[in-house]
Interface confidence: low
Amino acid sequence: IPVIEPSVPELVVKPGATVTLRCVGNGSVEWDGPPSPHWTLYSDGSSSILSTNNATFQNTGTYRCTEPGDPLGGSAAIHLYVKDPARPWNVLAQEVVVFEDQDALLPCLLTDPVLEAGVSLVRVRGRPLMRHTNYSFSPWHGFTIHRAKFIQSQDYQCSALMGGRKVMSISIRLKVQKVIPGPPALTLVPAELVRIRGEAAQIVCSASSVDVNFDVFLQHNNTKLAIPQQSDFHNNRYQKVLTLNLDQVDFQHAGNYSCVASNVQGKHSTSMFFRVVESAYLNLSSEQNLIQEVTVGEGLNLKVMVEAYPGLQGFNWTYLGPFSDHQPEPKLANATTKDTYRHTFTLSLPRLKPSEAGRYSFLARNPGGWRALTFELTLRYPPEVSVIWTFINGSGTLLCAASGYPQPNVTWLQCSGHTDRCDEAQVLQVWDDPYPEVLSQEPFHKVTVQSLLTVETLEHNQTYECRAHNSVGSGSWAFIPISAGAHTHPPDEFLFTP
């Protein structure tokens, strides 16, 4: 580390004095200090002498000696005061520029350390500092305004008390620049607008930034609109608002509106679309098929999308039958708004019961009139099967009735032994009935089919089983002939003897 002679931290001299500062290091050394007149520099290898024969207040400052070759970058410093009774301040710079929230050093150096007790910082023309100005003083460096704010961009003077009167420095202009994070923030409302020709409309374009220097304009289909601008300042941001008010819109007002704001950091733009229509409209649609099939006991949500202007004056779900006269519970109906002009209405039908099959209609009304969208809900049922023994045209016949939805298919099985259900090992014969007779097939009801199996002689140690199946499931009924007639076995439920 280099060494300075005289080896004191501070040196106080009078104007006109001779000052010699010598720096010695292991290698070559360099001096660094405030720019001031009358210094002579003499270097000789590992030493360097800084001297003046006529010190002035402008020589006041900190002189630092460094050794460029030192890998540790060590340095030594000495502060020189040239105490001039007429000049208590040496101002090193008349303009200081910092960004907001940085510390701003106003470099007025005190020329006499004795004066430190009576120093103060003021604004020019003796005006006091702004409230909340947090500052400190160092006789070596000057006044520091901590975490400077934009509003503190002012002209300042350093004041020292000399013989009972205040002596001011020359002024120092502080410029505190806003830290502009990017282009101004933008809002354009509404995001979408629909009006009927002749109605009033309002579009508001607003931009805000921490700095006042930004521009904002509203554009309609690439035409810049001349709109009086309202300006405001709150939450430490400058706000500029353009409000386009149209008392009676026409088709030429429709189109794309862009709100554009720019500053030194760049440009932001956001757009909305304004639609002008001849009259009120109301459109209902669904992404679902209007014909729905659901298994009994399961749940279903019916969804309708509504596009409307003006807004809906009424809407409801209605059950149109054909079963009970029940109506959907209001708590099961839900509405969500996608945006101003589009809504989704949902009817939740949990654990559907047989009586809830049928037509569900969503009705909506606005000044454009009524519209309705109707869903047809059919419930799916697994087949229910029953078998009876009868004589048709004198022939013994097994008659199987199966009801379910969708329409069940029927298969007959003949198997050995008496059993509730034929398994593969027991099966003697299988008959498929591709075209069972449809007994009933009404909308929203089960389909009932009938299949006949003509049996000349009933084998008593055998079982005849009618099986029916559809996409939901299957059902069966076992018929066991016994000497007294015949037994029928519905699966695991009850014994039936005709």
């Epitope: 009033a200 035409t223 810049k224 609109l225 001349a226 709109i227 009086p228 409000t243 386009l244 008010n245 149209l246 008392d247 009676q248």
Partner: antibody, heavy 124, light 108 residues
Framework: QVQLVESGGGLVRPGGSLRLSCAAS????????MSWVRQAPGKGLEWVSA????????NYADSVKGRFTISRDNAKNSLYLQMNSLRAEDTALYYC?????????????????WGQGTLVTVSS | QAGLTQPPSVSVAPGQTARITCGGN??????VHWYQQKPGQAPVLVVY???DRPSGIPERFSGSNSGNTATLTISRVEAGDEADYYC???????????FGGGTQLTVL
């Protein structure tokens, strides 16, 4: 202080031409539409013509349509009125005025700042 | 195109209230603006958008507009208010600025 200064008026014979100018200072000229309004001696105000902020749209009173042309040069902060086929009834004090378009509640236009006017006399 | 009708003159004593009307078919659906013109001077905007005042215009000047009549009201009239007053609307269909014929206000 916002200022509009008209020039170019004078005495001209019927059928002749004149070009009026209006120089704007101390306001953002290209933010405003501009208008010309005239006032015949001892009479009321009569709107003559208007031009949008960028010159893209112009319109005229029926009494001058086809004879007068409004234009602007935003780089020079200047508004112009080229008057051809002048008639005795065009004799008037001609004012230029900054025109505010579109404000709250309704779509409307009003004339915010006026110049002192330049006199046009059409006489044989 | 709208036609605006103003009375040619209105007289009022100092300190009293002057009311200047501007008539037009359904003028209440438009915005009305008022200008003051003193002899030998350019017009000055005193009320815009029916009832708003530009900065620097005294609160004594106010406006209203409904139905077929717009009104400029000057309360506590002073000698310095003596001037011609013009109403103005913008005709949206023709895109023309339209002035009324003007009213001369005399302070007695």
């Amino acid at each position: 202080q916002v200022q509009l200064v008209e020039s170019g008026g004078g005495l001209v014979r019927p059928g002749g031409s004149l070009r009026l100018s209006c120089a704007a200072s101390e306001f953002t000229f290209d933010d405003y539409a501009m208008s010309w309004v005239r006032q015949a001696p001892g009479k009321g105000l009569e709107w003559v013509s208007a031009i949008s902020w960028n010159g893209g749209s112009t319109n005229y009173a029926d009494s001058v349509k086809g004879r007068f042309t409004i234009s602007r040069d935003n780089a020079k902060n200047s508004l112009y009125l080229q008057m051809n086929s002048l008639r005795a009834e065009d004799t008037a004090l001609y004012y230029c005025a900054s025109t505010v378009e579109v404000a709250h509640r309704r779509l409307y236009k009003y004339l915010e700042v006026w110049g002192q006017g330049t006199l046009v006399t059409v006489s044989s | 195109q709208a036609g605006l009708t103003q009375p040619p003159s209105v007289s009022v004593a100092p300190g009293q209230t002057a009311r200047i009307t501007c008539g037009g078919n359904n003028i209440g659906s438009k915005s009305v603006h008022w200008y003051q013109q003193k002899p030998g001077q350019a017009p000055v905007l005193v009320v815009y958008g029916d009832s708003d005042r530009p900065s620097g215009i005294p609160e004594r000047f106010s406006g209203s507009n409904s139905g077929n009549t717009a009104t400029l009201t000057i309360s506590r009239v002073e000698a310095g208010d003596e001037a011609d007053y013009y109403c103005q609307v913008w005709d949206i269909s023709s895109d023309h600025v339209v002035f009324g014929g003007g009213t001369q206000l005399t302070v007695l």
